[in-house]
């Protein structure tokens, strides 16, 4: 039961995390105009990974896409790549983890196969979360560097007569969404990996015990619980006899009126 809960929770947390990574990647507020210690403008600038926007006091917002690929800073391209890789890995991880969920039965899929799929999706979520955190952190670092550079030469003028105020940018909402989302995806991935261990019980060496029931004897042989290493079914590891004694996980793996496919 605890394994199923851990796996389910890991899936939900990762799902929220990946939705957040997608949202952050699409958001326009990766960097926003710094209003602190600046002349108050009737125009507010903010920038995303794909376009930059200007919101006027009039309420009019104008956004322009970055229609060049070669002209963009390498760091911005790197951040884009990291976020996209994070989304792709996360999406594949979600797909794999759906089939790996213990509460969903697909044909006669072994618990061992589900364990492997859970581990695979968990690793994918961890890498996805790390990609998002790395992408957001690289962008944040770029902002901090540019902020202090523009602060150093904030006022550039001709003989001190005419001043040009450089627009400084600070952290936008997307950065915080990205950090949180990346963290959630990472946590979800760790939970999936933990659930994987519970899904694939280690080999238990039971002593052979004889049960005498109505004149004939049936023996339980050891080795019936060996973990599978592949995605396919492993017939070698099936129990010889299905008696009345079952483990908690076994009970759940058989269809009942409470199972929904």
């Amino acid at each position: 039961m605890a394994v199923t809960a851990c796996q389910g929770l890991g899936f939900v947390v990762s799902l929220i995390g990946i939705a957040g990574i997608i949202a952050a990647t699409c958001m326009d507020q990766w960097s926003t105009q710094d209003l602190y210690n600046n002349p108050v403008t009737a125009v507010f600038n903010y920038q995303g990974l794909w376009r930059s926007c200007v919101r006027e006091s009039s309420g009019f917002t104008e956004c322009r896409g970055y229609f060049t690929l070669l002209g963009l800073p390498a760091m911005l391209q790197a951040v884009r790549a990291l976020m996209i890789v994070g989304i792709v890995l996360g999406a594949i991880g979600l797909l794999v983890s759906i089939f790996a969920l213990k509460c969903i039965r697909i044909g006669s899929m072994e618990d061992s196969a589900k364990a492997n799929m859970t581990l695979t999706s968990g690793i994918m979520f961890i890498v996805s979360g790390l990609c998002a955190i790395a992408g957001v952190s690289v962008f944040a670092n770029m902002l901090v560097t540019n902020f202090w550079m523009s602060t150093a030469n904030m006022y550039t003028g001709m003989g001190g007569m005419v001043q040009t105020v450089q627009t400084r940018y600070t952290f936008g909402a997307a950065l915080f969404v990205g950090w949180v989302a990346g963290g959630l995806t990472l946590i979800g991935g760790v939970m999936m990996c933990i659930a994987c261990r519970g899904l694939a019980p280690e080999e238990t060496n039971y002593k052979a015990v004889s049960y005498h029931a109505s004149g004939h004897s049936v023996a339980y042989k050891p080795g019936g619980f060996k973990a599978s290493t592949g995605f396919g079914s492993n017939t070698k590891n099936k129990k010889i006899y299905d008696g009345g004694a079952r483990t908690e996980d076994e009970v759940q793996s058989y269809p009942s009126k409470h199972d929904y496919v």
């Epitope: 009737a42 125009v43 600038n45 903010y46 930059s52 006027e56 009039s58 001043q163 040009t164 105020v165």
Partner: antibody, heavy 118, light 113 residues
């Protein structure tokens, strides 16, 4: 078409208060800000500030903070300018203007002359 | 506050001649985000409210005759009336539409010579 109609001229004594109205029509009132501009006799234009009808948020120019208050009644699409403790130097024509994109004042009221005299 | 300085204070031009009004701001009105200059030009005739002519330094408001044109960037701007007509006699104001307060220039009075 967009129209801003202001209240009529006012003659007030020093120390009194006055409330100038600016009724908007021909557009969605809450979508665009209302600016107030003062023009003293024979002088240039002075931007007083503006009010956002969507949020009720106000921005005042430094010299118009205190005695000057912008308000709204969105149910009748009207903006108000209230001036308290009137002084002789408040004698001017007060204009309301709609803030349109490009931060431009595309429509103006006809102006309200406020005369402060003892 | 941003100071808007207009020159000349008054200008007398013959009908059909070119009239040029200059406006200088104490800080750049160019917004890096959209590369637009937030400068607006208004025309005010006696006893009337101001009328919008040009916004974003060079974009003509609809209904404004094409003899009116705006140019310039950063801190230096110009309003040009290519062929002065009798109805163009008025006071012209430039306005900073970028920084609060949204200050106006002192105005330039255009008359017929």
């Amino acid at each position: 078409q967009v129209q801003l109609v202001q209240s009529g001229s006012e003659l007030k004594k020093p120390g009194a208060s006055v409330k100038v109205s600016c009724k908007a029509s021909g557009y969605t009132f809450t979508n665009y800000g209302i600016n107030w501009v003062r023009q003293a006799p024979g002088q240039g234009l002075e931007w007083m500030g503006w009010i956002n009808p969507n949020t009720g948020e106000t921005t005042y120019a430094e010299e118009f903070k205190g005695r000057f208050v912008f308000s709204l009644d969105t149910s009748v699409s009207t903006a108000y300018l209230q001036i308290s403790s009137l002084k002789a130097e408040d004698t001017a024509v007060y204009f309301c203007a709609r803030l349109y994109y490009g931060n431009r004042f595309d429509s103006w009221g006809q102006g309200t002359l406020v005369t402060v005299s003892s | 506050d941003i100071v808007m300085t207009q020159s000349p204070d008054s200008l007398a031009v013959s009908l059909g001649e070119r009239a040029t009004i200059n406006c200088k701001s104490s800080q750049s009105l160019l917004n890096s985000g959209n590369q637009r200059n937030y400068l607006t030009w208004y025309q005010q005739k006696p006893g009337q409210p101001p009328k919008l002519l040009i916004y974003w330094a060079s974009t003509r408001e609809s209904g404004v005759p094409d003899r009116f044109s705006g140019s310039g960037s950063g801190t230096d701007f110009t309003l040009t009336i290519s062929s002065l007509q009798a109805e163009d006699v008025a006071v012209y104001y430039c306005q900073n539409a970028y920084y609060y307060p949204l200050t106006f220039g002192g105005g330039t009075k255009v008359e017929i010579k």
